[in-house]
């Protein structure tokens, strides 16, 4: 007996589709060998129609595919637009030839069953409504009109013109006439369910002179759309339910046995398993909306359904749309840490992957916010200025070509904890989610800058030093000047690296930056950081204030300039939250607060590359003028 298993008999009707699953034993060879589907001829020959090597016969062109699921030890043959010519004997199998391991499948495609010749067929989706047209002769105008549903023995009343209504149609069925036309009546049935499918008879009058019409009502469950996504990538469920449910709450749920568990809805419900990686976005007033899930996991695979109902929960008789999501474990998206840990006052460097084929795409970093339907306002991007409340402590370093960009956030507080998304204006599958956890610091930071009260005097020389521990000895140290376009690395040489590597004196490890002579443009945030090649590590930040020399004093040291900078920053946070509220007032904002900006620059990625120094790790540009001498003391 064959170790391959599948359905021995498959029966369907013309125009429909089949999805045949074949099961194979769990071995590495089986998972990787060729899979095929062939048709057996009278001679015993089996002619390949489709195989996993990419072969597709002419008769299957545009209507069939074969998908291998190595993690389930199955492969699936999907065939659409069936005709009676597809009836026959087939084999699904494994091996380089069609004489390998195989399983016999018989496929029978029948004609669509014949109905009485005068039958009118109405085909509707679940949850929709149907209006059945019932013509009659003028002499039956005064008579009773009715619609009944055929059962085995009788015809069960649905509704009649005397306002009798079957209990299962109360509130759903209406019998009416239009205008002055006395030759047609109509029956509208709303919130259709599977149980409404069947044969109906509408009738006007009684006895032999009655007008009758046969109606076949077909109520279809939506065919699930198949979605194939990579592990760690993202998926968007585009749900279009129609104008009639535009004002109802929307939901996405996942089938679980006989229930459908809501994952997210527009009433604020959200499954904790999707915290930080899901958004629901109302698209327009026509009942369209979308749900975006990032950071796909193996366990996210399954049968999803979207719908609309005032409760935000699935209800029978309301329109739905369905998908079958498959998550491919052989992913092109690199496996990165999904949780990054930092401490208060410290910093984190987050490596964001992007499709290496799209190195010129614009890169962004946004913070996922779960309130309402969820949204992800952009905090920084290659052409998006840093949000004001992140001034001096957030920068994006683009490293063109290597499939990674880095986002650095320093001066961490516990309020920074949360979920962040890496995204580009290119391949949307590469959206990834990072959870940032911030713990209270229990020790001194690794990098410390002196002096901490950094006020430089115009025209004079000013030096700041960055102390680092021996564990950073072999790493590259750098200073950069922060602007809301990035942190421009200043050229420096670290003389500490020339010392004997045998010993390391904790107290003397420092890299200094000197401004000589100090100018007004030097005022601002500076970062001291470490990195190894293109991999960024810790950073610390200092605000350098620039003041004019006061008479009678060669050096003024006012109260902590950084404290002043921080006060200003807190004021900015208040302002920015106000402007964000204004932003939220825009009708139907997208999931990203700066989405319009992303879309607008989307097509200009080539022409408008960020100008060299905005976050360029190796650009020696404008702030490296001759007045800056960087040396180690």
């Amino acid at each position: 007996k064959s170790p391959i298993f599948g359905p021995q008999e498959v029966s369907s009707i013309e125009g429909d589709s089949v999805s045949i699953t074949c099961y194979y034993p769990d071995t590495s060879v089986n998972r990787h060998t060729r899979k095929y589907w062939c048709r057996q001829g009278a001679s015993g020959m089996c002619t390949t129609l489709i195989s996993s090597n990419g072969y597709l016969s002419k008769e299957y062109s545009g209507r069939a595919n074969l998908i291998n699921f190595p993690e389930n030890n199955t492969f699936v043959i999907n065939i659409e637009q069936l005709t009676q010519d597809d009836t026959g004997s087939y084999k699904c199998g494994l091996g380089t030839s069609n004489r390998g391991l195989s399983f016999d499948v018989s496929l029978e495609v029948s004609q669509v069953p014949e109905l009485p010749s005068d039958t009118h067929v109405y085909t509707k989706d679940i949850g929709r409504n149907v209006t059945i047209e019932c013509p009659f002769k003028r002499e039956n105008a005064p008579s009773k009109k009715s619609l009944c549903k055929k059962t085995n023995q009788s015809c069960e009343l649905v509704i009649d013109s005397t306002e009798k209504v079957n209990p299962s149609y109360i509130g759903r069925a209406k019998l009416f006439m239009k205008g002055t036309d006395l030759t047609v009546f109509y029956v509208n049935i709303s919130h259709l369910t599977h149980n409404d499918a069947g044969l109906y008879i509408c009738q006007a009058g009684e006895g032999p002179s009655a007008d009758k019409k046969n109606v076949d009502l077909q109520v279809l469950a939506p065919e699930p759309e198949l979605l194939y996504k990579d592990l760690r990538s993202s998926v968007t469920f585009e749900c279009d339910l129609g104008r009639e449910v535009a004002n109802e709450a929307k939901y996405l749920c996942r089938m679980n046995k006989e229930t459908c568990d809501v994952i997210i809805n527009t009433l604020g419900k959200r499954d904790p398993d999707f915290e930080g990686r899901i958004l629901i976005t109302p698209k327009d007033d026509n009942g369209r909306f979308s749900v975006l899930i990032t950071g796909l996991r193996k366990e996210d695979a399954g049968h999803y359904q979207c719908g609309a109902h005032s409760s935000g929960l699935p209800q029978e008789g309301w329109p739905i749309q369905t998908w079958q999501l498959f998550v491919n474990e052989e992913s092109t998206i690199p496996n990165r840490r999904s949780v990054v840990k930092g401490v208060t006052g410290g910093s984190v460097a987050i490596a964001c992957p992007y499709n290496p084929k799209e190195s010129s795409s614009l890169k962004y970093w946004c913070r996922w916010e779960g309130d309402g339907n969820g949204h992800c306002p952009v905090l920084v991007g290659t052409q998006a200025q840093v949000q004001e409340e992140y001034e001096g402590r957030l920068a994006l370093f683009d490293q063109p070509g290597n499939g990674t960009y880095t986002v650095i956030l320093n001066q961490l507080t516990t309020e920074d904890a949360g979920f962040y998304w890496c995204l580009t204006n290119g391949d949307s599958r590469w959206r990834t989610t990072i959870e940032l956890q911030v713990a209270e610091a229990t020790r001194e930071p690794n990098l410390e800058v002196t002096p901490q009260n950094a006020t430089a005097v115009l025209g004079e020389t000013f030096t700041v030093s960055c102390h680092y521990p021996c564990k950073f000895y072999s790493q590259e140290k750098y200073w950069c000047k922060w602007s809301n376009k990035g942190c421009h690395i200043l050229p420096s040489h670290d003389e500490g690296a020339r010392q004997s590597s045998v010993s390391c004196d904790q107290s003397s490890q420092l890299v200094s930056m000197t401004l000589n002579p100090v100018s007004k443009e030097d005022e601002g945030w500076y970062w001291c950081g470490v990195k190894q090649g293109q991999t960024y590590g810790e950073t610390t930040a200092i605000y350098i204030a620039v003041e004019e020399r006061t008479r009678g004093s060669s050096h003024v040291n006012p109260t902590d300039a950084n404290a002043r900078a921080k006060v200003a920053l807190e004021e900015e946070v208040v302002d920015s939250s106000i402007s964000e509220k204004e932003n939220k007032a825009i009708p139907n904002p997208g999931p990203f607060a700066n989405e319009r900006e992303i879309q607008n620059v989307g097509d200009q990625a080539q022409e408008n590359r960020a100008s060299g120094d905005a976050g360029s790790a190796d650009g020696q540009s404008r702030s490296s003028s001759s007045k800056h001498h960087h040396h180690h003391h």
């Epitope: 008999e9 498959v10 006989e258």
Partner: nanobody, 126 residues
């Protein structure tokens, strides 16, 4: 919940036929497949046959031991599955269980089924 009730079991001679019925009630619209398993005394429950459906399309799966002798069918309107057993052998003696599933990854695996009937005894004497 879905309730399943089997009927049609009994004592027959080898070579005879028997027809089992499995009537489903409750939230049957959520079911996607119905099948039959059997369990002989002292043995594990084994797969016999399953029918799954999607719209007008039906898929029928059979164990090698019953292929060509047993036929599964269903009446959608009655929410009932049938097992027509021909050319019965003494080896077919067992309690036959009806099972229903909302999602089936592998029809041969009993744990894939969500609902089970109480079982009906089939005895084939030689």
């Amino acid at each position: 919940e879905v309730q399943l009730v089997e009927s049609g079991g009994g004592l027959v001679q080898a070579g005879d036929s028997l027809r089992l019925s499995c009537a489903a009630s409750g939230r049957t619209r959520t079911t996607y497949g119905m099948g039959w398993f059997r369990q002989a005394p002292g043995k594990e429950r084994e797969f016999v046959t399953t029918i799954t459906w999607s719209g007008p399309t039906n898929y029928k799966y059979y164990a090698d031991s019953v292929k060509g002798r047993f036929t599964i069918s269903r009446d959608n309107a009655k929410n009932t599955a049938y097992l027509q057993m021909n050319s019965l052998k003494p080896d077919d003696t067992a309690v036959y269980y009806c099972a229903a599933s909302t999602v089936l990854t592998d029809p041969r695996v009993p744990t894939e089924y969500d609902y089970w009937g109480q079982g009906t005894q089939v005895t084939v004497s030689s």
